[in-house]
């Protein structure tokens, strides 16, 4: 059903919104032991003028990264509404640009036990922490877009 | 529409500091990471630093030790600090607001440092 | 650091001609199926403009006669029919690895 502009949003609000939501919802705690530093994807990946559909695929490519992260299933469920969702109404918007498909990420070189036990709670942390931002902007960035098709 | 406008620059001796600003405006200055680069007369471009909506900052390892990169979100303003100044630092120095892709979307005017006893 | 080297460092052209600016990367520049590689004008006096990001990409109001091409390490910039108020110096710029980093710069000037 293809009309997010028609309908004032309603595709986006009844669907993609209630599920960023409930997964931000579900990490509010998360954000407090976050480092600062800047994510490359971030400052790579911006949602600015004339650019939002570009922004948007590539972190709806980058959310189904995280489908298989041994989380719950309701909140597997919501994170694949947001991807699926997102790259749907791009293509109901005529937003969506295609490119090549993503690189596997490499392998890690092997570590002790104990330093690979701590290194992978970091890294699970850092992703989440990754992962609430990534919600965050693309939440964001819709908003702008429907202002946007609301104002013409 | 978006505008950055560089000031501070000038004569200064070698080993002296300066403080470079370039005032923000046309765009929400917070949520962007912005970057200084500079261009001695004559020669290329040369990235200098970048400072991230949250303060996270990044630095050419190069100038790390003598340059330092700030930001005051509620003044629109970003700053680089720069001390033991050499003649080689004579240059144009430009703000540039970070775009898609890392890029440098937009410029400032530039403003001329040169370092001279 | 990553290095960049651009061809020619200059050329003569005339008005209407088809101009191609070549850049090479010391490594790859891609991540995540993305080429981080950018493109920039700059005019004497004045500050560098951004034509083309991420390889192919054209910047708003850039004229379409500019084109950008290539992954990896090897990188084309096109100008498909050259204009007067085209003669300038053209940088490409890498942004996957800190620190970011320029091309040596191409002077397009008037034959």
């Known amino acids: 059903d293809c009309d997010i502009e028609g309908k004032d949003g309603k595709q986006y609000e009844s669907v993609l919104m209630v599920s960023i939501d409930q997964l931000l919802d579900s990490m509010k705690e998360i954000g407090s032991n976050c480092l600062n530093n800047e994510f490359n994807f971030f400052k790579r990946h911006i949602c600015d003028a004339n650019k939002e559909g570009m922004f948007l695929f590539r972190a709806a490519r980058k959310l189904r990264q995280f489908l298989k992260m041994n989380s719950t299933g309701d909140f597997d469920l919501h994170l694949l509404k947001v991807s699926e969702g997102t790259t749907i109404l791009l293509n109901c918007t005529g937003q969506v640009k295609g490119r090549k498909p993503a690189a596997l990420g490499e392998a890690q070189p092997t570590k002790s036990l104990e330093e690979n036990k701590s290194l992978k709670e970091q890294k699970k942390l850092n992703d989440l922490c990754f992962l609430k931002r990534l919600l965050q902007e693309i939440k964001t960035c819709w908003n702008k877009i429907l202002m946007g098709t609301k104002e013409h | 529409q978006v505008q950055l406008v560089e000031s501070g620059g000038g004569v200064v001796q070698p080993g002296r500091s300066l403080r470079l600003s370039c005032a923000a405006s046309?765009?929400?200055?917070?949520?962007?990471?912005v970057h200084w680069v500079r261009q001695a007369p004559g020669k290329g471009l040369e990235w200098l630093a970048a400072i991230w909506s949250g303060g996270s900052t990044d630095y050419n390892v190069a100038f790390s030790s003598r340059f330092t990169i700030s930001r005051d979100n509620s003044k629109n303003t970003l700053y680089l600090q720069m001390n033991s100044l050499r003649a080689e630092d004579t240059a144009v120095y430009y703000c540039a607001r970070n775009g898609y892709g890392e890029s440098f979307a937009y410029w400032g005017q530039g403003t001329l440092v040169t370092v001279s006893s | 650091d990553i290095q960049m080297t651009q061809s020619p460092s200059s050329l003569s052209a005339s008005v209407g001609d088809r101009v191609t600016i070549t850049c090479k990367a010391s490594?790859?520049?891609?991540?995540?199926?993305?080429?981080?590689m950018n493109w920039y004008q700059q005019k004497p006096g004045k500050a560098p403009k951004l034509l083309i990001y991420?390889?192919?990409n054209l910047e708003s109001g850039v004229p379409a006669r500019f084109s950008g091409s290539g992954s990896g390490t090897d990188f084309t910039l096109t100008i498909s029919s050259l204009q007067p108020e085209d003669f300038a110096t053209y940088y490409c710029?890498?942004?996957?690895?800190?620190?970011?980093?320029f091309g040596g710069g191409t002077k397009v000037e008037i034959k």
């Open positions: 490594q790859s520049v891609d991540d995540d199926g993305d080429s981080y």
């Open positions: 991420m390889a192919s």
């Open positions: 710029q890498q942004s996957n690895e800190d620190p970011l980093t």
């Open positions: 046309g765009f929400t200055f917070s949520t962007y990471g």
